[in-house]
């Protein structure tokens, strides 16, 4: 569809009528002088010679002349009102590729590459200072101590999830990251004794401390990663280190 629909222009042609003026002239009437005779009248004589021209007659009425040739076209009339919109035309062909503002098509690509490089550097800094990376997972802590509900909310806020090790390497990475016990994304809140991840899936990897899980106090539905790398079940109301995992 055209961004600026064409507006039809109506041109009105004004033709001027041309005319021609013709004048007709009448003959002057001749007058004969009266003759006085003393004898009886004779027969009429032959007509006399023509008299002198009479005085010029008054101007006659205009005569009916022949129609003259068509005159030249008159001046352009004012534009008429816009006509109704026409029905949409057929879809036009794909236009040619537009040019970048400065005509340099490599600029956007170079900027994107620079941004990607900078992001990679920031990831490395984060890994070096705060986090640990294993495969396509990045474990990060903000160093805060909080309840399990708060940890869940914190991780979701940053589009991450509570750290959940799926193998020994991931478990070791979290262990190396923490300086105190940290919550894992594992609970048996739904079914007592059946520990699952936060999406409800059964665990394929566990690293329980000796004698755990023991559900001491009947309310130990959450799981802690101890500093020795082993797991312990604890109440979810306790406060421990928050560790989130980010997919990369």
């Amino acid at each position: 569809m055209s961004l600026f629909p064409s507006l039809p222009l109506l041109l009105l042609s004004m033709v001027a009528a041309s005319y021609s003026e013709t004048v007709t002239c009448e003959d002057a009437q001749k007058t004969c002088p009266a003759v006085i005779a003393c004898s009886s009248p004779g027969i009429n004589g032959f007509p006399g010679k023509d008299g002198r021209d009479g005085t010029k007659g008054e101007k006659g009425e205009p005569g009916q002349g022949l129609r003259g040739l068509q005159g030249p076209p008159g001046k352009l009339g004012p534009p008429g009102n816009p006509g109704p919109s026409g029905s949409p035309g057929p879809k036009g062909q794909k236009g040619d590729p537009g040019k970048s503002p400065d005509g340099d098509s490599s600029l956007a690509a170079s900027e994107r590459k620079a941004l990607q490089t900078e992001m990679a550097r920031i990831k490395k800094w984060l890994t070096f200072s705060l986090g640990k990376q294993v495969g396509n997972k990045f474990f990060l802590t903000n160093g805060e101590i909080m309840t399990f509900e708060k940890v869940k909310a914190l991780c979701v806020k940053f589009q991450a999830s509570v750290a959940t090790p799926r193998n020994a390497a991931e478990n070791g990475a979290i262990q190396n990251l923490i300086k105190e016990e940290a919550f894992l994304g594992i609970t048996d809140e739904k079914t007592e004794g059946q520990f699952v991840d936060l999406t409800g899936n059964r665990l394929t990897y566990t690293n329980w401390n000796e004698g755990e899980p023991n559900n001491a106090g009947s309310d130990e539905d959450c799981v802690l990663l101890l500093k020795n790398g082993q797991w312990n079940d604890v109440p979810c109301s306790t406060s421990h280190l928050a560790v989130c995992e980010f997919p990369i």
Epitope: I145, M146, T147, E149, K150, E180, E181, E189, A216, G217, S218, D219, E220, D221, K227, P235, C236, S237, T238, S239, H240
Partner: antibody, heavy 115, light 107 residues
Framework: VQLQESGPGLVKPSQSLSLTCTVT?????????WNWIRQFPGNKLEWMGY???????SYNPSLKSRVSITRDTSKNQFFLQLNSVTTEDTATYYC?????????WGQGTLVTVSA | DIVLTQSPATLSVTPGDSVSLSCRAS??????LHWYQQKSHESPRLLIK???QSISGIPSRFSGSGSGTDFTLSINSVETEDFGMYFC?????????FGGGTKLEIK
């Protein structure tokens, strides 16, 4: 967050002690564990038990057979019931919010068990 | 149950003195130990969590240290408002227990 204990100050031996803790400024179903703690005349503190935000309970084994903690979520209250009391149960009873530590406490209510 | 033993039972000091209060656990509790202050006719107030972590609103003269079984609460230059009872509490093992308390009194 404020917690306020209420209930009778005097209970007869062998009867049941019932206390209410009214919480304002925070929903007891949102998070944390909601506890009862008592302090004996000699200043010794004893954790009695809690009801968590999810409704699960945990009790001190020394009291388990005669203690019960329940709640009324519509009133944002939780309750302590201690059965078969003796004079040894005379104490100041506190309700408190727990998250590994007790950050918020009620002002306490003294309960005397006496004939 | 884990038993927490506080010492001394009573400590008499002069305002301006610096003091240390001890809390010993019957078995290792990592750093799962918290300190409270209780003034006469008041509820306990949290001073330190996880052995050494400060609490918002608590004066900086209060500090904690220790791990495993031995813990210390230090008060740098005691003020008159600091007199009262001090308790430790562990959250490492259920049931959660308190120490017997140390009474800090004016000499």
């Amino acid at each position: 967050v404020q917690l306020q204990e209420s209930g009778p100050g005097l209970v007869k031996p062998s009867q049941s002690l019932s206390l209410t803790c009214t919480v304002t400024g925070y929903s007891i179903t949102s998070d944390y564990a909601w506890n009862w703690i008592r302090q004996f005349p000699g200043n010794k503190l004893e954790w009695m038990g809690y009801i968590s935000y999810s409704g699960s309970t945990s009790y001190n084994p020394s009291l388990k057979s005669r203690v019960s903690i329940t709640r009324d979520t519509s009133k944002n209250q939780f309750f302590l019931q201690l059965n078969s009391v003796t004079t040894e149960d005379t104490a100041t009873y506190y309700c408190a919010r727990w998250e590994s530590w007790f950050a918020y406490w009620g002002q306490g209510t003294l309960v005397t068990v006496s004939a | 149950d884990i038993v927490l033993t506080q010492s001394p039972a009573t400590l008499s000091v002069t305002p301006g003195d610096s003091v240390s209060l001890s809390c010993r656990a019957s078995q290792s509790i990592s750093n799962d130990l918290h300190w409270y202050q209780q003034k006469s006719h008041e509820s306990p107030r949290l001073l330190i969590k996880y052995a050494s972590q400060s609490i918002s609103g608590i004066p900086s003269r209060f500090s904690g240290s220790g791990s495993g079984t031995d813990f210390t609460l230090s008060i740098n230059s005691v003020e008159t408002e600091d007199f009262g009872m001090y308790f430790c509490q562990q959250s490492n093992s259920w049931p959660y227990t308190f120490g017997g308390g140390t009474k800090l009194e004016i000499k």
